[in-house]
């Protein structure tokens, strides 16, 4: 159901395109899977089997207008934010001060973008400036990949396959972001 069979309005499917936008702060209203009441697992996905199909991640979505300075897209767009835990992380207790925290050991599974759509949008600008077209890249699906421990964690492996794809000189980005930085990145990531 949906976009796989319906490619129009100047879109194309682009697998595996580089970096991806982080979730905007507005998505906090969606229930996440990394909650204590679920033991860090999404509901209805207990990960009791080793089946690859059990390793799934959550595709949250958001809607926005594409902006470029004072210019704004004539139509809004929608895309996915890849979220959640991809598998049964092995947890070890660690004491910090009086409390405990948990860290995963073993392979690190990440829910990351799998496919992108290239979308041509028309930007409308104030002050009588002529509209201009711009191509943006929007996340269209997510996938679980395994982050290996080799090469300074620079490789991501497709879950269930052995073929590793080196990521070209990318440094891992810190997860904590301010709302403003997040929004700025979302608006300027294209």
């Amino acid at each position: 159901q949906g976009w796989q069979a319906f490619k129009n309005d100047a879109t194309e499917i682009i697998p595996e395109l580089g970096e991806y936008p982080e979730p905007p702060p507005e998505l906090e209203n969606n229930k996440t899977m990394n909650r204590a009441e679920n033991g860090g697992r999404p509901p209805h996905h207990p990960f009791e089997t080793k089946d690859v199909s059990e390793y799934s991640c959550r595709e949250l979505h958001f809607t926005r207008y594409v902006t470029d300075g004072p210019c704004r897209s004539a139509k809004p767009v929608t895309e996915l934010v890849c979220s959640g835990q991809c598998g049964p992380a092995r947890l070890l207790p660690n004491a910090i001060g009086r409390g405990k925290w948990w860290r995963p050991s073993g392979p690190d599974f990440r829910c990351i973008p799998d496919r992108y759509r290239a979308q041509r949008v028309q930007l409308l600008c104030p002050g009588g400036e002529a509209p201009r077209a711009r191509k943006v890249r929007l996340v269209a699906s997510c996938k679980c990949k395994r982050l290996t421990r080799f090469h300074n964690q620079s490789e991501l492996k497709d879950f269930g396959t052995e073929a590793a794809r080196p990521q070209k000189g990318r440094k891992p980005r810190p997860r904590a972001r301010s709302a403003k930085a997040n929004q700025a990145e979302l608006e300027n990531a294209y």
Epitope: Q1, A5, F6, K75, A140
Partner: nanobody
Amino acid sequence: EVQLVESGGGLVQAGGSLRLSCAASGRTFSRDVMGWFRQAPGKVREVVGSIKWSDANTYYADSVKGRFTISRDNAKNTMYLQMNSLKPEDTGVYYCAAAIIGGTYNDWGQGTQVTVSS
């Protein structure tokens, strides 16, 4: 193309509630997400929120979080916008639209007027 028809708008006092409906017909298989948008007089159209049809995952603009709720009825091919604790600044024409994931909202309804009086 997806045909969209909004209904349920009207005049309501501040603090009151309204429920808008958006009925979809036509090539509904081609829509993954449906959204609500609004346009106040003299202002640009803004996002209210949206719902992913497959799993009912919702997204809301900050200005309506906690007051508005989007839901959908698969059997009726209809999306709803429950608006509570309405404010005068919620006044405007409310539109529903449909999109495919990773695309633009290309299919739009004709809009329904919501007026919140103080």
